[in-house]
């Protein structure tokens, strides 16, 4: 007996061929021996089975001895043994219909779990193998679970259902709701304008929710809310903003915040949260601000950075076109009685300059 696998909602064609290439009488029946369809004269007739309005045949192929049955909009309960009767012979085809669906919405927050459930006919014992867009392979039986979704899990998942050495492939589009970056650091000289951007890693037709930026300044003992905002159909509106600093926010996506001036008292780290309508949980992005200041006071040239820096970062003071350099893996470096000229303060990571500030030392007469 031939086995054919079908997908819920799809169309399947069960083939039946006569030995003679001519139009002859045929019938398709189900396992209850109830007629689904057949030929009467030159006309296709439908029996009273549940498939009556979803079954059809390719009349154009009848005179070639092909008497296939096409079943549209497959349902799990269409799984059955179908019998084609033609030329006093019977051909049996076992149809097994499977469905694979995500247990919840296919738009999930980063960190949430995804469960894929296989609908299968009674008595079947299928296996399922799924491959994520990032190439992660997961195997299972009736259910497949991905405990913690990551950004790279966004996209089309390809799942293969196997039964009786036959396979059927499902494609499920999963959207992981997250910011493009988990964390970002902005390096600024004191006094410069600061731009914070929070691009989303997904697009939705209607995007509604609310958000807030909490800030923990390095110098402060506790964190505070710098701004709260609403998002309605991709339009941003500020609800509340602190007086110091007075942040400005763009009205369109991506979420965009402007801090008029980078000052040492603002250096620190923030957490932007976004709660989306009809979704449990929040999207998070961490943002860090590192501020650099170079000063000359009397005979002391100092360069300082504030904010979250890694211990492996190097802070250097260097006289332009001269070899004189002071470097430290610290948050402040200084030179006593510096030579006159243009000094550069550099914050670098493995030779890559992250931030630089120039200060001119004038000769003292």
């Amino acid at each position: 007996k031939k086995v054919v696998l079908g997908k819920k909602g799809d169309t399947v064609e069960l083939t039946c061929n006569a030995s003679q290439k001519k139009n002859t009488q045929f019938h398709w029946k189900n396992s209850n021996q109830i007629k689904i369809l057949g030929i009467q004269g030159l006309f296709l007739t439908k029996g009273p089975s549940k498939l009556s309005d979803r079954a059809d045949s390719r009349k154009s192929l009848w005179d070639q001895g092909c008497f296939s049955m096409i079943i549209k909009n497959l349902k799990i309960e269409d799984s059955d043994t179908y019998i084609c009767e033609v030329e006093n012979k019977k051909e049996e085809v076992e149809l097994l219909v499977f469905g694979l669906t995500a247990n919840s919405d296919t738009h999930l927050l980063e960190g949430q779990s995804l469960t894929l459930t296989l609908e299968s006919p009674p008595g079947s014992s299928p296996s399922v193998k799924c491959r994520s867009p990032g190439g992660k392979n997961i195997q299972g039986g009736r259910t497949i679970s991905v405990p913690q979704l990551e950004r790279q899990d966004s996209g089309t998942w390809t799942c293969t259902v196997s039964q009786d050495q036959k396979t059927v492939e499902f494609k499920i589009d999963i959207v992981v709701l997250a910011f493009q970056k988990a964390s970002s650091t902005v390096y600024k000289k004191e006094g410069e304008q600061v731009e914070f951007s929070f691009p989303l890693a997904f697009t939705l037709e209607k995007l509604t929710g609310s958000g807030e930026l909490w800030w923990q300044a390095e110098r402060a003992s506790s964190s505070k809310s710098w701004i709260t905002f609403d998002l309605k159909n991709k339009e941003v509106s500020v609800k509340r903003v602190t007086q110091d600093p007075k942040l400005q926010m763009g009205k369109k996506l991506p979420l965009h915040l402007t801090l008029p001036q980078a000052l040492p008292q603002y250096a620190g780290s923030g957490n932007l949260t976004l709660a989306l309508e009809a979704k449990t949980g929040k999207l998070h992005q961490e943002v860090n601000l590192v501020v650099m200041r170079a000063t000359q006071f009397q005979e002391n040239l100092t360069c300082e950075v504030w904010g979250p820096t890694s211990p492996k970062l190097t802070l250097s003071l260097k006289l332009e076109n001269k070899g004189a350099t002071v470097s430290k893996q610290a948050k402040a470096v200084w030179v006593l009685n510096p030579e006159a000229g243009m000094w550069q303060c550099l914050l670098s990571d493995s030779g890559q300059v992250l931030l630089e500030s120039n200060i001119k030392v004038v000769p003292t007469w």
Epitope: H27, N32, Q33, I34, K35, Q40, T45, K46, G47, P48, S49, K50, S52, D53, R54
Partner: antibody, heavy 120, light 107 residues
Framework: QVQLQESGPGLVKPSETLSLTCTVS????????WSWIRQPAGKGLEWIGR???????NYNPSLKSRITMSVDTSKNQFSLELSSVTAADTAVYYC??????????????WGQGTTVTVSS | DIQMTQSPSSLSASVGDRVTITCQAS??????LNWYQQKPGKAPKLLIY???NLETGVPSRFSGSGSGTDFTFTISSLQPEDIATYYC?????????FGGGTKVEIK
């Protein structure tokens, strides 16, 4: 044992719409075809059509243009509407359950029938 | 549509008699035929399915035969409670169609 009960007006004016409802009790309406069959006084049985619980329908071609069938699974009810009625539509209307089993397809449960007269 | 022609339209027989009703289909319906009994003022009741299979609980005096286009329904020994109208019904193709009925009376 599943029971069926037809309800609706016993008198309908010509050109109006006949509306009948069948309530299924002592059983679920799910996973069956539910049909309407009529019988004019002293005459034979005529199959009007059927509806599955999913809402898919099959109608008798002779009445197709005038029939609308619907199902309300939450109320365990299914309904028939027959538009533009004439005196020829006067009959006893039965609601019924159709059943498929090995080698059998037919009506296994019938309502008691309701008489509908078309007259002005 | 498949037309079902039943004959006779009525008959009168004595208790204990053998009664035979025929049903002819306008085209081949294999053995997709049911026989129903309808007593006055009541809904029909299934007696025979698939041309010759006796429904559970139906007395064995009722039987059916035939295939293709010609079918026969028999009551081997007519009983007073068998006074009713008998209908054949095909389920080969939609729409389901019934014969015109045979009214059985007792002499």
């Amino acid at each position: 044992q599943v029971q069926l009960q037809e309800s609706g007006p016993g008198l309908v004016k010509p050109s109006e719409t006949l509306s009948l409802t069948c309530t299924v009790s002592n059983g679920s309406i799910s996973d069956y075809y539910w049909s309407w069959i009529r019988q004019p006084a002293g005459k034979g049985l005529e199959w009007i059509g059927r509806i599955y619980t999913s809402g898919s329908t099959n109608y008798n071609p002779s009445l197709k243009s005038r029939i609308t069938m619907s199902v309300d699974t939450s109320k365990n009810q299914f309904s028939l509407e027959l538009s533009s009625v004439t005196a020829a539509d006067t009959a006893v209307y039965y609601c019924a359950r159709e059943l498929e089993r090995y080698y059998f397809y037919g009506v296994d449960v019938w309502g008691q029938g309701t008489t509908v007269t078309v007259s002005s | 549509d498949i037309q079902m022609t039943q004959s006779p339209s009525s008959l009168s027989a004595s208790v204990g008699d053998r009664v035979t009703i025929t049903c002819q289909a306008s085209q081949d319906i294999s053995n997709y035929l049911n026989w129903y009994q309808q007593k006055p003022g009541k809904a029909p009741k299934l007696l025979i399915y698939a041309a010759s299979n006796l429904e559970t609980g139906v007395p064995s005096r009722f039987s059916g035969s035939g295939s293709g286009t010609d079918f026969t329904f028999t009551i081997s020994s007519l009983q007073p409670e068998d006074i009713a109208t008998y209908y054949c019904q095909q389920y080969d193709s939609l729409p389901l169609t019934f014969g015109g009925g045979t009214k059985v009376e007792i002499k």
